[in-house]
Interface confidence: low
């Protein structure tokens, strides 16, 4: 075209893939009449007519642009829809009158790449490799033009470094015309890189300016020889018998060496290998005082075949031995005295406490409990607790039963029981004493006896309420070598006037359950009238 060398640089129009490019014909009225314009696309220096404007009316030429072109802005602007990377070229408009002039437009097309996808080398990298090894691969798909990649380690950009860092990037053109970039980071790593975070960054341009996208951060498995082996005990702190204790070997190499844990035999002073679980952990569950001792770990490094030994570690499983109380089964007469002594061994200083078993009341802080002028009520359970105050939960206890010689002692002397005729009553009677009493009833029925504790017994009787029984009542008799005692249960018939909703009724020490003789499944708890409680 004559005079082309003097033409100014084309106007730059930037647009994203898929959007519409507005190509404004920049011819002035002096250069040409915009109602009579030809539009061309220029590709590889070849012009192709793509659109004609005549008398302000537009007409697409057959070809690749036929469906995507239209006139806007009273014919001065050509709109190109659904822009693709292949549209990145020069477009020119040519006015026909008064003389042939042209205006060139350079269309630049952009497309942001997808989020970069980073894949780490799953097989890992040894630290002693000759050449840089593949650390990770970064792929940025469907960008235009080709984005730039920058690799980062721990937030710092990586640069090519001979024999240390090599970045190998390649790109492929998709059928869409978009580029997919693949970048492989190769590096010689050191042990300290085991926790290093690598990521890649894609830098690209859009009409709005420069942008970037970052991949997720990855770490690469780094293999390095073991230099140190050590033991770790869980839980940390003071250990006690009964704990679950785990002794594990740790090493600063990857992969870890083959571990074995041994304990020094206190007799022979020889190290004896302990049996570990599949993970090489020695589990002591429950831990015992015998587990105390000197442990060490041996790590056989499969790379160097060097055997590494840990620093020995003293393990102390704190314990409290079985608690011994003397006398073990004390028997005393009423009015006498008793000294109870508690003994135990421990790996730590012990504290002793004496408690009353029935109430939990603390009677004495110390190993010796002195009881004077013993009464019947002093009979029963006493518990010695030996504990290590510095180790919560480390304690042992022993229960001792103090027996006070005496005749049977009844829970109640007499009681009224409200009944209905022809019901089956469930009566109970309780007595204590030393030796422990036995109980008998003065009526026929089904009786059963339960020992409540070494000095106390409970007897229950199922009996049918008859007129004779109502007349005589029921007696229970407790007896032992030192005597006997009786409780009387008076049976009273219930009528509507006896029990009213606002009657001030109460239950005694034991409940009596009455059942109709004809309906064995139905039970009712009888209510008792107020009565004085007496103990014989």
């Amino acid at each position: 075209v004559p005079g082309e060398a003097e033409q100014p640089a084309p106007e730059l129009v930037e647009v994203e893939v898929g959007s519409t490019a507005l190509l404004k014909c920049g011819l002035s009225q002096s250069q040409g009449n915009l109602s009579h314009v030809d539009w061309f696309s220029v590709h590889k220096e070849k012009r192709t007519l793509i659109f004609r404007v005549r008398q302000g009316q537009g007409q697409s030429e057959p070809g690749e642009y036929e469906q995507r072109l239209s006139l806007q802005d009273r014919g001065a602007t050509l709109a190109l829809t659904q822009v693709t990377p292949q549209d990145e070229r020069i477009f020119l408009c040519q006015g026909k009158r008064p003389r042939s002039q042209e205006y060139r437009i350079q269309l630049r097309v952009y497309k942001a790449p997808e989020e970069p996808n980073i894949q780490v080398n799953p097989l890992g990298i040894p630290v002693n490799s000759k050449e840089p090894e593949e650390v990770a691969t970064c792929v940025g798909r469907n960008g235009y033009p080709i984005p730039q990649v920058i690799w980062y380690k721990n937030g710092r950009p990586l640069k090519e470094e001979k024999n240390r860092v090599h970045i190998q990037s390649s790109q492929t053109v998709e059928s869409s015309g978009l580029y997919t970039l693949q970048s492989i980071l190769k590096a010689q790593l050191v042990k300290e890189d085991k926790d290093a975070q690598f990521y890649c960054e894609l830098n690209y341009r859009l009409p709005s300016g420069n942008h970037m996208k970052e991949s997720r951060e990855v770490t690469v498995p780094v293999f390095y020889p073991t230099e140190k082996v050590w033991l770790e005990v869980e839980p940390v702190g003071m250990l006690k018998e009964g704990d679950r204790v785990e002794i594990r070997c740790l090493a600063d190499g990857n992969p870890p060496p083959h571990f074995s844990i041994s304990k020094q035999n206190p007799s022979t002073r020889e190290a004896e290998e302990e049996t570990t679980n599949d993970n090489g952990v020695l589990v002591l569950e429950p831990a015992r005082k015998e587990h105390s001792g000197r442990y060490e770990c041996q790590g056989l490094d499969l790379d160097t075949m060097i055997s590494l030994l840990s620093e020995p570690q003293e393990l102390l499983v704190n314990y409290v031995s079985d608690v011994r109380v003397s006398p073990a089964a004390p028997e005393r007469q009423e009015g006498s005295s008793l000294t109870l002594t508690c003994e135990a061994e421990s790996s730590q200083d012990l504290e002793f406490q004496w408690l009353r078993e029935e109430t939990g009341q603390v009677l004495e802080r110390g190993p010796v409990l002195q009881l004077h002028d013993l009464k019947r009520e002093a009979g029963g359970g006493y518990r010695c607790v030996a504990s290590v105050p510095s180790i919560p939960g480390l304690n042992r206890t022993q229960l001792v039963n103090v027996a006070i010689f005496g005749p049977p002692w009844m829970a109640f002397k007499e009681r009224k029981v409200w009944v209905k005729e022809n019901m089956v009553l469930n009566l109970s009677c309780e007595a204590s004493g030393h030796p422990r009493p036995t109980i008998s009833w003065n009526v026929n029925g089904t009786a059963s006896e339960q020992d409540q504790d070494p000095q106390r017994v409970l007897s229950t009787l199922n009996v049918l309420v008859t007129p004779e029984l109502l007349e005589t009542g029921v007696e229970c008799t407790a007896s032992n070598d030192l005597g006997k005692n009786t409780s009387i249960l008076f049976l009273e018939l219930v009528n509507l006037t006896t029990l009213t909703p606002d009657s001030n009724t109460t239950t005694g020490l034991s409940t009596s359950t009455a059942s109709p003789h004809t309906r064995a499944n139905s039970t009712s708890t009888e209510r008792k009238l107020p009565e004085p409680e007496s103990r014989g």
Partner: antibody, heavy 119, light 108 residues
Framework: EVQLLESGGGLVQPGGSLRLSCAAS????????MSWVRQAPGKGLEWVSA????????YYADSVKGRFTISRDNSKNTLYLQMNSLRAEDTAVYYC????????????WGRGTTVTVSS | SELTQDPAVSVALGQTVSITCRGD??????PTWYQQKPGQAPILVIY???KRASGIPDRFSGSDSGNTGSLTITGAQAEDEAAYYC????????????FGGGTKVTVL
């Protein structure tokens, strides 16, 4: 003591399938990549396939790609090789090997299991 | 890419023998050497720069220069008679492994 024990070999017709297993013990199986290596009668060693410790990545020699599948069950400490569309040239002793450093060294080998492909 | 070994080599008892392994991949990777006796599985002999595997006598040593690796037996013994294979990663795809064709060592 590290031990690898292959099983599952046998006689199979061309086009048939076999599944080899390798039971591992004496080490933390999931920490190591594993490989299958074969040796045809009177021939040298040929690497067949490898798998990463987690089982997430697998690699194959061109001669078996698309026909063989390597896998592992870390809960059972077992490596597998599923062999389909077997050919006469697949006849070999198949060894499983522990892959120290994930690709540098086969430091422990099994005794091998024999696969014969013949009509 | 491939690894090339001499098919056979013989050595007098007590003498020194070197087995070579050539291949492009040895520019990037140290060769690993395996010993295999008839009817047995291979065992690891030398790996890395010059590391002997557990239980391997110190008469075995490895070296490498450019694209060639060597296994040397200094003072060969009768029990060293075996096939020796070199192995390396494939330089074109380092996830793949290569084996040499093997060298049969005969101790005379």
């Amino acid at each position: 003591e590290v031990q690898l024990l292959e099983s599952g070999g046998g006689l199979v017709q061309p086009g048939g399938s076999l599944r080899l297993s390798c039971a591992a013990s004496g080490f933390t199986f999931s920490s190591y990549a594993m490989s299958w290596v074969r040796q045809a009668p009177g021939k040298g060693l040929e690497w067949v396939s490898a798998i990463s410790g987690s089982g997430g990545s697998t690699y194959y020699a061109d001669s078996v790609k698309g026909r063989f599948t390597i896998s592992r069950d870390n809960s059972k400490n077992t490596l597998y090789l599923q062999m389909n569309s077997l050919r006469a040239e697949d006849t070999a002793v198949y060894y499983c090997a522990r892959d120290l450093y994930g690709g540098f060294v086969f430091d422990y080998w099994g005794r091998g299991t024999t696969v014969t492909v013949s009509s | 890419s491939e690894l090339t070994q001499d098919p056979a080599v013989s050595v007098a008892l007590g003498q020194t023998v070197s087995i070579t392994c050539r291949g492009d991949s040895l520019k990037n990777y140290y060769p690993t050497w395996y010993q295999q006796k008839p009817g047995q599985a291979p065992i690891l002999v030398i790996y890395g720069k010059n590391k002997r595997a557990s239980g391997i006598p110190d008469r075995f040593s490895g070296s490498d220069s450019g694209n060639t690796g060597s296994l040397t037996i200094t003072g060969a013994q009768a029990e060293d008679e075996a096939a020796y294979y070199c192995s390396s990663r494939d330089s074109s795809d380092n996830h793949l492994r290569l084996f040499g064709g093997g060298t049969k060592v005969t101790v005379l």
